[in-house]
Interface confidence: medium
């Protein structure tokens, strides 16, 4: 079976079932309802989840039991459209069960929510999750695929049973261990750190498809795919990028049993072929399905072949430039960005993007012209500013934050977005700046020819969060123009933004500024998102503050928490001297 | 040594349709993708439609998008276009050739089958 099966099965539900296996089944339809309707009780989705798997079954059966030949969508839309609270729970969700399929399928769509009105998860002690663990086992791992479906709601929905597997295993050895938070805690931190991540690259790859359409992210695909594969020619490319298109396609729309199938099948594909991709998938296709495809994903660049010949023989030089641009424009066009991203691991796909689209725009310009050949002889000299900019803007930052560190990195950044679209909610501009400041620590450290690849795609990802949570409910039309208007030339935009002069500042209110005991009592991290709150709110009440103004407040305000922190009577001396710091704040920054 | 002969050109009149074969021997054909290339009456060369080792994805030039089809039989180590709703500018030599392993060169081609729409 390729990827492309075109074979008609009677029974879509039955075919999937047998394909995927009962267990991978049941756990990609939960992730799927969790992922649509998230704010139903975990039992709801359980007791949905089983009568789909039991009709399943009877499909498997007999693929001709009635209702058996029914699309997925069908079959999985009128069961959630049985939920009894659905116009309680999800107010206008709730008239997407009125249309037909496909309509209701885009409907439910639609009403995703990347940022859903849910209580934070908080990490119950070890011995209680041990025995929770060892009490019910599959119950367990339910809740853990539902909680993290429900909170991202575009995660990609076969690496999440990856992630299963890997929560499982970290029970399964840290529960036994002599010190089992020693064992167990760092596995878990790490797995949220990697899952947070995870869904944020999926966001942005759903974000490319749906808001840009296939041919963005099928260019995406060529770029990082020829800079991954280097060897590949670019028919195998091209291969690769349609099944792994029609994959993201999928799994996007919600088509995650397709889309988990297809996924195994292109895993299944690639180690068959390997000679012909690259020399660094052995150890990946060694390993059982679910690590192989993450690995696969995962891999490092193959070596880029000896004496590849100069570009500018086929795609400047040549006569027949035009007439093949002509011909075919997009395969020209992939031909163009298969041959520089192979030659160029150092460049981010983004930037590759933006060179092809030169090209491209060069092109369309120059074969119309009376003079071919002579128009476009030079397209190669206006890639030289779109190189160094990305690079220039690297140093810089890198040089910023081995001077500050991650924290006063994240705060020089707070700053810096805070004054460039203050309009934004204080939660949004905290999350993504502190996510932006986290390029330093994964980045800088690497040489200078991944640290472009590193950085800007990694911007990609946390701008495309800023995108998508704006988009929700927007405030800032100059966020909108940068989310809009190209996805490779977001983070130049938003780069380019400088200080809003349109802003009129808010209104100062001590009650933002006022702090408790409980403050003493809050992880490092959670801590300094409190301080890093109360610094987006006074750029906000004082956007033409200086940087020595600011620093002088926060470096008073770490004082106040550290000294109150330290009291015998917290509560009364966070009164007493919050009062006095909000007094010489005002007067510090002229409120 | 590789060899590429195609067959399936003829005389047909505009609107008409013919079915072009190309038998491959000499390489791995399983592993190689393919395409079709033309050359009209004193033109230059124009490629035509390209087609992957696994029978997928295909490709195809603007000018004869929805009227040809690409397709291959990799058990029989022959290569198939089926073109349709000819016009009298589909009228040139058609040749298969072995894709290019990445630059805009092809490796192998065959002698070619002309084909002629003409009322």
């Known amino acids: 079976r390729g990827v492309f099966r075109r074979d008609a099965h009677k029974s879509e539900v039955a075919h999937r079932f047998k394909d995927l296996g009962e267990e991978n089944f049941k756990a990609l339809v939960l992730i799927a309802f969790a992922q649509y309707l998230q704010q139903c009780p975990f039992e709801d989705h359980v007791k949905l989840v089983n009568e789909v798997t039991e009709f399943a079954k009877t499909c498997v059966a007999d693929e001709s039991a009635e209702n058996c030949d029914k699309s997925l969508h069908t079959l999985f839309g009128d069961k959630l459209c049985t939920v009894a609270t659905l116009r309680e729970t999800y107010g206008e969700m709730a008239d997407c069960c009125a249309k037909q399929e496909p309509e209701r399928n885009e409907c439910f769509l639609q009403h995703k929510d990347d940022n859903p009105n849910l209580p934070r998860l908080v990490r119950p002690e070890v011995d209680v999750m041990c025995t929770a663990f060892h009490d019910n086992e599959e119950t367990f791992l339910k809740k853990y695929l539902y909680e993290i479906a429900r909170r991202h709601p575009y995660f990609y929905a076969p690496e999440l049973l990856f992630f299963a597997k890997r929560y499982k295993a970290a029970f399964t050895e840290c529960c036994q261990a002599a010190d089992k938070a020693a064992c167990l805690l760092p596995k878990l931190d790490e797995l949220r750190d990697e899952g947070k991540a995870s869904s944020a690259k999926q966001r942005l790859k759903c974000a490319s498809l749906q808001k840009f359409g296939e041919r963005a992210f099928k260019a995406w695909a060529v770029a990082r795919l020829s800079q991954r594969f280097p060897k590949a020619e670019f028919a195998e490319v091209s291969k690769l990028v349609t099944d792994l298109t029609k994959v993201h396609t999928e799994c996007c729309h919600g088509d995650l049993l397709e889309c988990a199938d297809d996924r195994a099948d292109l895993a299944k594909y690639i180690c068959e072929n390997q000679d012909s991709i690259s020399s660094k998938l052995k150890e990946c296709c060694e390993k059982p399905l679910l690590e192989k495809s993450h690995c696969i994903a995962e891999v490092e660049n193959d070596e880029m072949p000896a004496d590849l010949p100069s570009l500018a023989a086929d795609f400047v030089e040549s006569k027949d430039v035009c007439k093949n641009y002509a011909e075919a424009k997009d395969v020209f066009l992939g031909m163009f960005l298969y041959e520089y991203a192979r030659r160029h691991p150092d460049y981010s796909v983004v930037l590759l993007l933006r060179l092809a689209k030169t090209y491209e725009t060069t092109l369309e310009k120059c074969c119309a012209a009376a003079d071919p050949h002579e128009c476009y002889a030079k397209v190669f000299d206006e890639f030289k500013p779109l190189v160094e900019e990305p690079q220039n803007l690297i140093k810089q930052n890198c040089e910023l934050f081995e001077q500050l560190g991650e924290y006063k990195f994240q705060n020089a950044l707070l700053v810096r977005y805070t004054k460039k679209v203050p309009q934004v909610s204080t939660p949004t501009l905290v999350e993504v700046s502190r996510n932006l400041g986290k390029v330093g620590s994964k980045c800088c450290k690497h040489p200078e020819a991944k640290r472009m690849p590193c950085a800007e795609d990694y911007l990609s990802v946390v701008l495309n969060q800023l995108c998508v949570l704006h988009e929700k409910t927007p405030v800032s039309d100059r966020v909108t123009k940068c989310c809009t208007e190209s996805l490779v030339n977001r983070r130049p935009c938003f780069s380019a933004l400088e200080v809003d002069e349109t802003y009129v500042p808010k209104e100062f209110n001590a009650e933002t500024f006022t702090f408790h005991a409980d403050i003493c009592t809050l992880s490092e991290k959670e801590r300094q998102i409190k301080k890093q709150t109360a610094l987006v709110e006074l750029v906000k009440h004082k956007p033409k503050a200086t940087k020595e103004q600011l620093k002088a407040v926060m470096d008073d305000f770490a004082a106040f928490v550290e000294k109150c922190c330290k009291a015998d009577d917290k509560e009364t001396c966070f009164a007493e001297e919050g009062k006095k710091l909000v007094a010489a704040s005002q007067a510090a920054l002229g409120l | 040594e590789v060899q590429l002969l195609e067959s399936g050109g003829g005389l047909v009149q505009p609107g008409g349709s013919l079915r072009l074969s190309c038998a491959a021997s000499?390489?791995?054909?399983?592993?190689?993708?393919m395409l079709w290339v033309r050359q009209a009456p004193g033109k230059g060369l124009e490629w035509v439609s390209v087609?992957?080792?696994?029978?997928?994805?295909?490709y195809y030039a603007d000018s004869v998008k929805g009227r040809f089809t690409i397709s291959r039989d990799n058990s029989k180590n022959t290569l198939y276009l089926q073109m349709n709703s000819l016009r009298a500018e589909d009228t040139a030599v058609y040749y298969c050739a072995k894709f290019p392993s990445s630059r805009m060169k092809f490796d192998y081609w065959g002698q070619g089958t002309l084909v002629t729409v003409s009322s």
């Open positions: 000499g390489f791995t054909f399983d592993t190689s993708s």
């Open positions: 087609i992957h080792q696994s029978g997928t994805p295909t």
